[in-house]
Interface confidence: low
């Protein structure tokens, strides 16, 4: 299709070498009901077009994205050629920064509903460059935390070195929606709620003698609770003794709740005490079974192929730890009475003999 009729927008992505930041292009097409009103030249500078991304509305048109090669080759379909660029409804998400993202990107509706729509397209000329050393090195992070229930602010990384007074007018978007109430280089939040979490985009215009560019930065905002002041608590096992059948397989599950921590390094392991010996057991990886804003429940199982007489003399200990401290829960196995006959006991003794040999040959693992 002929792209000469597309409205054109110039964007600059000055990426920080410090973080693996993302970048977003919006397809600035008007809403479907305004689709005849397609050429950006007819919009006054104050009429900011409504962005379409991140909405659930069923009647919004999906768009097709292309990249225009600099050598004049035919337009390339983004999805086929660029795996690090994700098309998400009406946005284009760049997962990794780099000057190789520099180029022209074109979007247009997938479904052409009227003759007017043929020329309904937007061409975005994107220039990507690393932040120069001369510019501010201590800019705001592209990942920012807001503490729930407190006041906070979200800073535009490309402008955070400037005072509010000298900052240009900024256009903010949250999850693709225009935030019309704020025009400064930071958004002040009086009280932080979960809904403040999301992807924020800040734009401002930079002009030189030749042309004007939109400088854009993307900020991932996370709402968090304060770091826990508690060590983890073990939810399961509750009882310190467990009735078992000799010769049968057994799984003992350890479940523990860990409070939120900014740097989260949970430790969960099983170890065995046998007389004066103690060693850690190699067990399947721990897995998160429930995660909320305030805490996370993690489970790790110890699996015995067959319970032996020796196991009845051992203590199985689940150990959990966070940065505050650790908690343990011990479990002693107890044979179920009247559960098996003579054959079971002979079988259990045979297993115990094999297990003793295995135990002795692997015993260099003990602490």
């Amino acid at each position: 299709f002929n792209i000469s009729g597309c409205s054109t927008k110039k964007l600059l992505w000055a990426y920080s070498t410090r973080s693996e930041e993302e970048f977003i292009l919006f397809c600035d097409l008007p809403e479907p009901q305004k689709s005849h009103f397609c050429h950006r030249s007819q919009l006054s500078p104050t009429q900011v077009p409504d962005h379409l991304p991140f909405t659930d509305s069923k009647d919004l048109p999906d768009v097709q994205w292309y990249r225009q090669p600099s050598n004049g080759d035919p337009l390339e379909d983004i999805r086929k050629s660029y795996p690090h660029i994700i098309q998400d409804k009406c946005t284009l998400r760049f997962l990794t920064p780099g000057v190789n993202n520099t180029g022209s990107y074109i979007c247009r509706p997938k479904m052409i509903k009227s003759p007017y729509d043929v020329a309904c397209c937007v061409k975005m000329i994107l220039e990507v460059k690393p932040q120069s050393n001369a510019s501010c090195e201590n800019s705001a992070s592209h990942k920012q935390d807001l503490l729930l229930g407190s006041t906070g602010s979200i800073s535009c990384p490309s402008l955070s070195c400037q005072s509010d007074a000298q900052s240009p007018e900024v256009t903010w978007y949250k999850n693709g929606k225009l935030l019309s109430m704020t025009r400064s280089n930071r958004i002040v939040v009086d009280e932080v709620y979960i809904y403040h979490q999301g992807t924020y985009v800040c734009d401002y215009t930079q002009s030189d003698t030749a042309s004007s560019w939109t400088v854009r930065a993307v900020v991932q905002v996370r709402t968090i609770v304060g770091d826990t002041k508690l060590k983890p608590d073990i939810l399961d096992p509750v009882e310190s003794t467990l009735e078992v059948e000799l010769g049968k397989p057994l799984t003992i599950s350890c479940k523990a709740r860990f409070g939120f921590e900014r740097v989260f390094n949970p430790v969960m392991k099983w170890y065995i005490k046998d007389a004066d010996l103690e060693w850690e057991v190699s067990v399947p990886e721990a897995k998160s079974i429930k995660s909320t804003l305030k805490d996370e429940i993690i489970e790790r199982n110890i699996i015995l192929e067959k319970v032996t007489q020796r196991d009845l003399r051992r203590t199985f200990v689940c150990f959990v730890q966070n940065s505050i401290g650790n908690t343990t829960q011990s479990v002693q196995l107890k044979e179920k009475r009247g559960s098996g006959g003579l054959n079971d006991i002979f079988e259990a003794q045979k297993i115990e003999w094999h297990e003793t040999v295995r135990f002795q040959s692997h015993h260099h693992h003990h602490h």
Partner: antibody
Framework: QVQLQESGPGLVKPSETLSLTCTVS????????WSWIRQPPGKGLEWIGY???????NYNPSLKSRVTISVDTSKNQFSLKLSSVTAADTAVYYC??????????????????WGQGTTVTVSS | AIQLTQSPSSLSASVGDRVTITCRAS??????LAWYQQKPGKAPKLLIY???SLESGVPSRFSGSGSGTDFTLTISSLQPEDFATYYC?????????FGQGTRLEIK
């Protein structure tokens, strides 16, 4: 450009409380974590603790019983109090900003901006 | 607490030399390791974060590598301004800890 400046008395008597303030200029204290670090003469660096602009703190267990870090967002300052000091607390005390790093599938913090440090001597 | 052990504690080298400093963690810390440079009477300066990422404005002769427990800082060609003390720091778990430092002197 964000700059940090430590201030407070350079001499503190044993058993008294050491009080230092770090003033953040050229940027807002909001949305960042802020740490205190110290360095005894001729020795290495020891992390004391951090504070989030909202007041959430985390302290080094070795000093926890004696440390309080507080923040005053209206003044763009955060402060350190260390009680019951002894000669072993003589050190250069630094304040620093912890900046979030989106690293290989994780999210952690490094100290990218530091104050120039202030020397505190504990002596009678 | 995670202990970080740097080696050597001090070394002498000449301008133009290639220098390697190692840092060993007492337990695995993934890539959550940073390197700092400190000159006498000055605050530490961030050089490397995430074990191998170069901080903005730091010369490319500095590089970092490693993951888990063993890490290295390499200066490919020493310059006069590189003579200083270097510290590694882990931010994998609390408390945050630093290595004891490596003093780099002019031979």
């Amino acid at each position: 450009q964000v700059q940090l400046q430590e201030s407070g008395p350079g001499l503190v008597k044993p058993s008294e409380t050491l009080s230092l303030t770090c003033t953040v200029s050229g940027g807002s204290i909001n949305n960042y974590y802020w740490s205190w670090i110290r360095q005894p003469p001729g020795k290495g660096l020891e992390w004391i603790g951090y504070i989030f602009y909202s007041g959430t703190t985390n302290y080094n267990p070795s000093l926890k019983s004696r440390v309080t870090i507080s923040v005053d967002t209206s003044k763009n300052q955060f402060s350190l109090k260390l009680s019951s000091v002894t000669a072993a607390d003589t050190a250069v005390y630094y304040c620093a900003r912890d900046v979030g790093i989106a690293a290989r599938n994780s999210y952690y913090y490094v100290m990218d901006v530091w104050g120039q440090g202030t020397t505190v001597t504990v002596s009678s | 607490a995670i202990q970080l052990t740097q080696s050597p504690s001090s070394l002498s080298a000449s301008v133009g030399d290639r220098v390697t400093i190692t840092c060993r963690a007492s337990q695995g810390i993934s890539s959550a390791l940073a390197w700092y440079q400190q000159k006498p009477g000055k605050a530490p300066k961030l050089l490397i974060y995430d074990a191998s990422s170069l901080e903005s404005g730091v010369p490319s002769r500095f590089s970092g590598s490693g993951s888990g427990t063993d890490f290295t800082l390499t200066i490919s060609s020493l310059q006069p301004e590189d003579f200083a003390t270097y510290y590694c720091q882990q931010f994998n778990s609390y408390p945050i800890t630093f290595g004891q430092g490596t003093r780099l002197e002019i031979k």
